[in-house]
């Protein structure tokens, strides 16, 4: 019986040029997590494998990072990142969990975002 | 199997600079946070922040911005971290841990005392 | 930032006895970790995801909690468990750990 729940970060929006972290996270459930898929819509942007570490797809290296935690942050966003997203939780034995979260790119500044992750 | 070995204890002046070292092995360093934490007597663990090797990405408690900074060298599987203008209050033992989802892996600790 | 507060600080238990230690969130979070440390090793991690306990920690170990309440609890103290115990939030950056719980045994 899956008896987990999932917390996301729910429908956010940024600005464009600028960057977002997605957050899901999976409680209530003793539940081993193996894998986390980030995917938009039916590409996948990003593996967090329990024993292999993070795998970013490499049509997105350069504006995808691992992290903080589980998540993931966008950067250099463009209007056409808007869209739904997907955490996708693999556990064992429960199964899959699945977040979805929506993120609308803005071209002015009204936008929030907080990103705090950085590439030197 | 997975291993965090860190550099040796440090004796410092204040306002000197030291930096300490964690090399892993047994696993892809690439792939994994490497997050580095501050114990003192009595105060508990702190964090100070974080580093992506794969591509040097960095996550900073804000207490800690000016204070320390990482690198890492991913043809020598090693994270580094220096902290400046060293006092008494950076007189601690520093843990490097990998992370992925908690800390799963930590290095033995490298005690940095700051005396004159 | 988000606060996690250990109660007690200092504990000492009986064998045998029941222990409770508990972390207290100053705003909810998803789930905590546990991590055991022992004087002179560096600290280990107990019990994942507030109720997962890590590989070879004792059954007589759990972890339970929601929102601000989380608790890790010793149905039958031994003498391997007296350890500082320090719970994490990996909610919300920065990542904060508990003030720690000493538990002696008696």
């Known amino acids: 019986m899956m008896t987990g729940t999932i917390e996301t970060t729910g429908n956010i929006s940024a600005e464009k040029g600028g960057s977002i972290i997605l957050q899901c996270h999976l409680s209530s459930t003793t539940a081993q997590v193996t894998q986390v898929n980030w995917e938009q819509q039916d590409q996948l942007l990003a593996i967090c494998n329990a024993d292999l570490g993070w795998h970013i797809s490499p049509s997105f290296k350069d504006r995808v990072a691992p992290g903080p935690g589980l998540g993931l942050t966008l950067q250099s966003l463009t209007v056409n990142d808007t869209g739904e997203y997907f955490c996708i939780y693999h556990t064992y034995p429960d199964g899959t969990y699945t977040g979805r979260i929506f993120l609308e790119v803005l071209e002015s500044s009204v936008a929030e975002h907080g990103a705090r992750f950085q590439i030197p | 199997q997975v291993q965090l070995q860190q550099s040796g204890a440090e004796l410092m002046k204040p306002g000197a600079s030291v930096k300490i070292s964690c090399k892993a092995t047994?696993?892809?360093?690439?792939?994994?946070?490497i997050e580095w934490v501050k114990q003192r007597p009595g105060h508990g663990l702190e964090w100070i922040g974080e580093?992506?090797?794969?591509?040097?990405?960095?996550n900073y408690n804000e207490k800690f911005k000016g204070k320390a900074t990482f690198t890492a060298d991913t043809s020598s599987n090693t994270a580094y971290m220096q902290l400046t203008s060293l006092t008494s209050e950076d007189s601690a033992v520093y843990y490097c841990?990998?992370?992925?989802?908690?800390?799963?892996?930590w290095g033995q600790g490298t005690s940095v005392t700051v005396s004159s | 930032q988000i606060v996690l507060t250990q109660s007690p600080a200092i504990m000492s238990a009986s064998p045998g006895e029941k222990v409770t230690i508990s972390c207290s969130a100053s705003?909810?979070?998803?789930?905590i970790h546990w991590y055991q440390q022992k004087a002179g090793s560096s600290p280990k991690p107990w019990i994942y995801?507030?109720?997962n306990l890590a590989s070879g920690v004792p059954a007589r170990l759990s972890g339970s909690g929601s929102g601000t309440s989380y608790f890790l609890t010793i149905s039958s103290m031994e003498a391997e468990d007296a350890a500082t115990y320090y719970c994490?939030?990996?909610?919300?950056?920065?990542?904060?750990f508990g003030g720690g719980t000493k538990l002696e045994i008696k």
């Open positions: 580093i992506f090797p794969g591509s040097g990405g960095t």
């Open positions: 995801r507030t109720s």
């Open positions: 705003s909810s979070v998803s789930y």
């Open positions: 047994g696993y892809t360093f690439s792939r994994y946070w």
């Open positions: 841990a990998r992370h992925l989802g908690a800390l799963d892996y």
């Open positions: 994490q939030q990996y909610h919300s950056n920065p990542w904060t």
